[in-house]
């Protein structure tokens, strides 16, 4: 049997026998274009492609549409994988989305959506989510139905304000909605009463800025 040399996601890498978490090279569907991603091979059976991570505020997430499209940061630390890659990937097969959250008091929680995909750029990478379970709130902190993605230079929200400019970071803002995992990073003891922080409303409320977040995807049939 010939060894697979290109992988579209971390699940394929895991199934090929590479089961150590770390940075791997993925290939865009139906293309030779490559992208580097962090693969989590430990959580819940492994095979997770990490599409977002926050942990220390070392990376500025107040970026342009182009930067969110193409990705930024370092897969070893804080980063955004890239809307275009995620859109193409999740348009090919059914994916689940797992969001892991940490607060400043040592608590952890997660939200798991059993179907996740991003529409194409022509639809402003609108997010589609169904089937929420998990410990980070019984109601989805990503507005349902899904919103278009907005950045500081591309305002696609439903507010008479500009959510991305005000709340910081690119996100699927509604008006402006109950979450923003790409908000301003606030250190401990400065993380409360911050409406522009890293927010997951149905776990910690509107003014609490989280310590760490990870968004990861995996094929539903993994």
């Amino acid at each position: 049997k010939e060894e697979q040399t290109t992988f579209r996601d971390c699940a394929e890498i895991f199934k090929s026998g590479l089961t150590t978490s770390g940075i791997y090279t993925l290939t865009f569907p139906n293309s030779t274009e490559e992208i580097k991603a962090y693969c989590d091979m430990d959580v819940g059976g492994g095979g997770w492609t990490v599409i977002q991570h926050r942990e220390d505020g070392s990376v500025d997430f107040q970026r342009t549409w182009k930067e969110y499209k193409e990705g930024f940061g370092s897969p070893l630390g804080e980063y955004w994988l890239g809307n275009e890659f995620v859109s193409q990937l999740t348009g090919q097969h059914r994916y689940v989305l797992k969001i892991q959250l940490k607060d400043w008091e040592g608590n952890e929680a997660h939200s798991l959506y059993d179907h996740f995909y991003l529409a194409g750029e022509e639809s402003n990478y609108r997010i589609h989510l169904t089937g929420l379970t998990g410990t980070a709130g019984k109601i989805s902190s990503i507005s349902q139905p899904g919103s278009d993605f907005s950045t500081k230079d591309s305002d696609n929200d439903k507010c008479i304000c500009k959510c991305s400019q005000m709340l910081s970071g690119g996100w699927w803002f509604d008006a402006c909605g109950p979450s923003n995992l790409n908000g301003q990073y606030y250190p401990q003891k400065q993380n409360t009463n911050k409406f522009n922080g890293i927010k997951w409303y149905y776990w910690k409320g509107s003014g609490y800025s989280l310590k760490a977040t990870t968004m990861m995807i995996r094929p539903a049939d993994f």
């Epitope: 909605g177 606030y186 400065q190």
Partner: antibody, heavy 122, light 112 residues
């Protein structure tokens, strides 16, 4: 289209009660904090009361504390202000106003009702 | 309570000319998150107030770009680059940094 339609104003004697209503449409009412703001005849604006999206947090101006009660019914998309022990100085146009941002972020009032006049006079 | 002081209280302006309204607060409005919770509202004759500027300098959607807000801490300014007839009314600043929210006395803009 966001709409806040008010009702319940009128003339009332000092010491009596009145209930104002604000019917909301065009947005997810249960996601927004709501306020009452009043304006005495020929005067400026005065904030009166606030209620959070779920109704769990409530604030009042000192001038109405203990006499006015703000409430909401998210199932009916409605906001209320129960005004008891009314005084002449409560005479004003009362406006309901919606927070600019959802989920209890207090950054100003994005939308206002048309106002309803309350006259307290014997 | 925070006292908001506007000046001038009356502002006669010729159409096409600029206008400027000052708003001063008795304490700093700069929040620990870096924002000034200072809004500007316009109340046109016989109408409800409408939001013009939020968080000191952000123009609400639909507000003409001739309106701009600036300032930080205790001193804020609303500027209209070229006044038009439809801009007449009373302008109010409002602070939301400190509870309770408080308004300025209002500035009446009228056309000369």
């Amino acid at each position: 289209e966001v709409q806040l339609v008010q009702s319940g104003g009128g003339v009332v004697q000092p010491g009596r009660s009145l209930r104002l209503s604000c019917a909301a449409s065009g947005f997810t009412f249960s996601s927004y904090g709501m306020h009452w703001v009043r304006q005495a005849p020929g005067k400026g604006l005065e904030w009166v009361s606030y209620i959070s999206s779920s109704g769990s947090t409530i604030y009042y101006a000192d001038s109405v504390k203990g006499r006015f009660t703000i409430s909401r019914d998210n199932a009916k998309n409605s906001l209320y202000l129960q005004m008891n022990s009314l005084r002449a100085e409560d005479t004003a146009v009362y406006y309901c106003a919606r927070d600019l941002l959802d989920y209890d972020i207090l950054t100003g009032y994005g939308y206002w009702g048309q106002g309803t006049l309350v006259t307290v006079s014997s | 309570d925070i006292v908001m002081t506007q000046s001038p209280l009356s502002l006669p302006v010729t159409p096409g000319e600029p206008a400027s309204i000052s708003c001063r607060s008795s304490q700093s409005l700069l929040h620990s998150n870096g924002y000034n919770y200072l809004d500007w509202y316009l109340q046109k004759p016989g109408q409800s107030p409408q939001l013009l500027i939020y968080l000191g300098s952000n123009r609400a959607s639909g507000v003409p770009d001739r309106f701009s807000g600036s300032g930080s801490g205790t001193d804020f300014t609303l500027k209209i680059s070229r006044v038009e007839a439809e801009d007449v009314g009373v302008y109010y600043c409002m602070q939301g940094t400190h509870w309770p929210p408080t308004f300025g006395q209002g500035t009446k803009l009228e056309i000369k």
